[in-house]
């Protein structure tokens, strides 16, 4: 039995994280066969925490492959009958010790989960579970507390209406106080600790014990081939019980002696050295969360679980945070709804993963009369006067850039700006200098618009401005109407999507 890094997983890791001494605790949780780890359901069959935990101190360069484990057994008492099929959850917790750790600190190092099938009264079943880089070797068994007996810890109590009616020498039956305890059914003298019976007057031994009353420990010393060990001074006692005495084969396996040891012929559905391992098939539904079980048609073949989206683990028992992979593009909000992933897109983006930019030139164009310019795989907006920003949605001060040349005064206008030119200058931006002698402006003004004819010139400028203003206003109206239509379409789609999301979240 050990807890440590698995084989081929690089440098052995210390559980203490180089933070001084720590202790390991194990929490064992038993759930009925239908339990599903992902729902964090109660440990309905029982739970227990290991005790007498040795302190582990990390030494530089020391291998973490054999960590000191809690002494003794972790006993998980269960009520009522033993279900046979159950879920076993073993959590390895680290308690960081020492002042520099800021007082005791608890961390979950590893959690292993698996569905198991195990008859009560059988020998120890061995298991190895890997999770991440850790590997846990452990054994488990189920034992009945008297008066319950058999593979399912069925109660052998006589039904009575009240405890007061129990006959002489009989006590109320536990945990069924409305019944009475039955007389002993095992062979008289059968060890209550190391023996059990499924039929009256029999005494079957648990692993490690032998003899007619299961009171003799099986030795693993040099006396194995010469039978039972005697007192230290006398060596080994001969003869003694054979390897098959007390039948070490569980679950109905038949024992045969082979060169001083034994071999078990296991019935269908069981395997292992002592027939202690029960074969879980796909028909038992070992995969959680609707996972698909493949293989495992018979107990001798292993099964594999193919997990639904959002789940992982050998039995699909672990929920995956798929949003941690940041699947939503362009700043979209990720929602993991279990079997579906939804992205709530920011304004201007759409698609299952917010991958479509609605603001590209093919989609919703630049606002407020701006024109879209594409190039180099990107787009930008060339904004109309008075607007700025990525999409021309921000109002800009058209006079901020001092557009009027030669001391002209700038006046902000709803459609842009107007320059009032200083004497001697003309043009939309006061860019033309007018010669005082009435000669051509520099650069030349159009023929017929001489300074000598200021009224006609002013009328021309006003006419140009009016035409420009009308064109801009018309453009804005057209763009606003088309944008409203497009926005309404996307808002409708977004409302529908949010409704679906809300329904799925509620489901």
């Amino acid at each position: 039995h050990s807890f440590g890094p698995g084989p081929g997983l690089g440098t052995p890791r210390s559980p203490c994280n180089a933070r001084g001494p720590c202790r390991l605790f194990f929490r064992v949780c038993l759930k009925p066969g239908v339990s599903q780890e992902a729902t964090e359901s109660l440990c309905a069959l029982g739970a227990a925490l290991s005790t007498s935990v040795p302190v582990y101190t990390e030494h530089p360069g020391e291998s973490a492959a054999a960590l000191p484990l809690p002494d003794g057994l972790v006993r998980v008492p269960f009520r009522d009958a033993w279900p046979g099929t159950f879920s076993l959850v073993i959590e390895t917790w680290r308690e960081q010790l020492g002042e520099h750790a800021g007082g005791p600190a608890w961390n979950l190092l590893a959690r292993v989960v698996g569905r198991r099938r195990l008859a009560a009264g059988g020998p120890w079943a061995r298991d190895v579970q890997r999770t991440g880089t850790w590997e846990l070797h452990f054994s488990y068994r189920a034992r009945c507390e008297p008066p319950a007996v058999g593979a399912a810890c069925a109660r052998l109590c006589r039904s009575r209406s009240a405890p007061s009616r129990c006959g002489p020498g009989l006590r109320p039956c536990t945990p069924f106080p409305d019944e009475c305890e039955a007389p002993s059914v095992c062979r008289p003298g059968c060890s209550p600790e190391h023996g059990y019976c499924e039929e009256p007057d029999e005494c079957r031994c648990l692993e490690g014990w032998t003899g007619p009353l299961c009171t003799v420990p099986v030795s693993t010393s040099s006396c194995l081939n010469s039978r039972v060990p005697g007192p230290a001074s006398t060596g080994c006692l001969l003869p003694g019980p054979g390897p098959c005495d007390g039948n070490p084969c569980a679950n109905g396996g038949s024992c045969s002696e082979t060169s001083g040891s034994f071999e078990c012929a296991c019935p269908r559905g069981f395997y292992g050295l002592r027939c202690e391992v029960s074969g879980v098939t796909c028909a038992d539904g070992p995969c959680f969360n609707g996972g698909l079980c493949v293989g495992g048609e018979d107990p001798d073949s292993a099964y594999v679980c193919h997990c639904p989206p959002g789940f992982q683990g050998s039995n699909c028992e672990k929920r995956v945070d798929r949003c941690s992979l940041q699947p939503c593009q362009n700043g979209g909000l990720c929602l993991d709804l279990g079997h579906a992933l939804r992205c709530r897109c920011r304004a201007g983006f759409a698609g299952p993963r917010c991958e479509h930019d609605l603001d590209d030139c093919a989609g919703r164009a630049c606002a407020n009369g701006g024109t879209c310019v594409e190039g180099g795989g990107s787009r930008r907006c060339s904004c109309a006067l008075g607007f700025g920003g990525r999409d021309c949605r921000e109002r800009a001060d058209p006079c901020a850039s001092r557009p009027c040349a030669h001391g002209g005064r700038c006046y902000a206008h709803f459609s842009g700006l107007v320059c009032a030119c200083a004497p001697g200058y003309m043009g939309v931006r006061c860019e033309f200098a007018v010669r005082p002698d009435g000669a051509d402006a520099v650069p030349a003004a159009p023929r017929g618009l001489r300074q000598a004819d200021p009224q006609r010139f002013l009328a021309g400028v006003i006419a140009v401005i009016v035409v420009v203003v009308i064109a801009i206003v018309a453009g804005i109206v057209v763009l606003v109407i088309s944008r409203k239509k497009r926005m309404a379409k996307y808002e409708k789609a977004e409302i529908k999507e949010m409704g679906e999301m809300h329904r799925e979240l509620n489901a």
Epitope: K31, P32, G285, C287, G290, P308
Partner: antibody
């Protein structure tokens, strides 16, 4: 051998009700999600609904087309899942199959429901 | 819901020939696609899961490929018992949806 056997189909008038049953054998029924999938005559497959495990409070999910009209329940002690169909419409006419898991690995032989006046 | 489009609707082939069935998804479904076989008067049967994995007991002549939006079921050499309707189904997004089916008939 795994077997799923549907029953309870028949002819019913629009607006009527029907209760389908699916009895499972050869599997540890209480460990399996159960689904109903239907197939209209000459058409493809359509998922109807699903019921999960006791540990998931027997959570149910339904297709939009049947939401509010159909109800799925299960009795683990009897290895049986049910589909209660109310306010039936002509478009509910189909062969109804029960299937297991998220991936529909085991299927029953189906039971025919005809909604006609 | 994700829409699956199968093509062709009907495939007329002779025993021993190779059959290639296509399934296109309306959006990315990763590899969460299964293929089902349905013979007349029978219930559907799972053939392929996870786009390319054969389910328990399915003969090696059936193979699946693809990821994202384009998927293919290939029957390398048609046996008489393979003439049936084949459906693809997506299991990426809940609820699961199916394609309209491809009928493989004897030429």
């Amino acid at each position: 051998e795994v077997q799923l056997v549907e029953s309870g189909g028949g002819l019913v008038k629009p607006g009527g009700s029907l209760r389908l049953s699916c009895a499972a054998s050869g599997i540890t029924f209480s460990n399996f999600w159960m689904n109903w999938v239907r197939q209209a005559p000459g058409k493809g497959l359509e998922w109807v609904g699903q019921i999960r495990l006791k540990s998931e409070d027997y959570a149910t999910h339904y297709a939009e087309s049947v939401k509010g009209r159909f109800t799925i329940s299960r009795e683990d002690s009897k290895n049986t899942v049910y589909l209660q169909m109310n306010s039936l419409k002509t478009e509910d006419t189909a062969v109804y199959y029960c299937t297991t898991g998220y991936y529909f690995d085991y299927w029953g032989q189906g039971t025919t429901v005809t909604v006609s006046s | 819901n994700i829409v699956l489009t199968q093509s062709p609707a009907t495939l007329s082939l002779s025993p021993g020939e190779r059959a290639t069935l296509s399934c296109k998804a309306s959006e990315n479904v990763g590899t969460y696609v299964s293929w089902f076989q349905q013979k007349p008067g029978q219930s559907p049967r799972l053939l392929i899961y996870g786009a390319s994995n054969r389910y328990t007991g399915i003969p090696a002549r059936f193979s699946g490929s693809g990821s994202g939006t384009d998927f293919t079921l290939t029957i390398s050499s048609l046996e008489p018992e393979d003439f049936a309707v084949y459906y693809c189904g997506q299991f990426y997004s809940f609820p699961s949806t199916f394609g309209g089916g491809t009928k493989v008939e004897i030429k």
